[in-house]
Amino acid sequence: LTCLGGFASPGPVPPSTALRELIEELVNITQNQKAPLCNGSMVWSINLTAGMYCAALESLINVSGCSAIEKTQRMLSGFCPHKVSAGQFSSLHVRDTKIEVAQFVKDLLLHLKKLFREGQFN
């Protein structure tokens, strides 16, 4: 039983699977969007260099009370090696450039699809 228990417990998720699941979640958000996402909240735009996942999380974590993106926030935290809390400002943000959450999610989705096609899973 002890041995079999190892099979039942989930192992680490392959990066390709994690990225695909994040893409699927963003697709769900963009397709199911009826009213303005998160009441039209604005977030910092981001640079797409290394650390992009943390920067995306740092932007989105500042949106509170928006259940539609809570799963995305949790999934992004799995890609970010450090703890992210609201109010942080990363050098990966584009200062003075805010965009709507809906556009941010849409653009992040486009970028992640490109990464997936190119096999860049981390």
Partner: nanobody, 118 residues
């Protein structure tokens, strides 16, 4: 709101040079492949040049190859088109646009007029 604002057009003599700029806002510019299209008076829209998101892959229509150079500065959210050795047939309204195959990602500016005439 997504905005693409072209500038740099004007009246120029044949053989002259112009540099068009396109200031992008309201979206994550660095994610998008971008390009320039043009529409000459009484003609259809012609794709002139495109550049990938990272700025390292470019495409040019045969009609402008060797004369036009596309570039981008992702830190400034700006797309450029350097136009040299201009000809009368380059007269057109030039539009900055996204160049993505993915549906729903197509945006275009209002255009800037380039007139090549002596």
């Amino acid at each position: 709101e997504v905005q693409l604002l072209e500038s740099g057009g004007g009246l120029i003599q044949p053989g002259g040079s112009l540099r068009l700029s396109c200031a992008a806002s309201g979206f994550i510019f660095a994610v998008y492949d971008m390009g320039w299209a043009r529409q000459a008076p009484g003609k259809g829209l012609e794709w002139v040049s495109s550049i990938n998101d990272g700025g390292n892959v470019t495409y040019y229509a045969d009609s402008v190859k060797g004369r036009f150079t596309i570039s981008r500065d992702n830190s400034k959210n700006t797309l450029y088109l350097q136009m040299n050795s201009l000809r009368a047939e380059d007269t057109a309204v030039y539009y900055c646009a996204t160049a993505e195959d993915e549906p729903g990602y197509d945006y275009r500016g209002q255009g800037t007029l380039v007139t090549v005439s002596s």
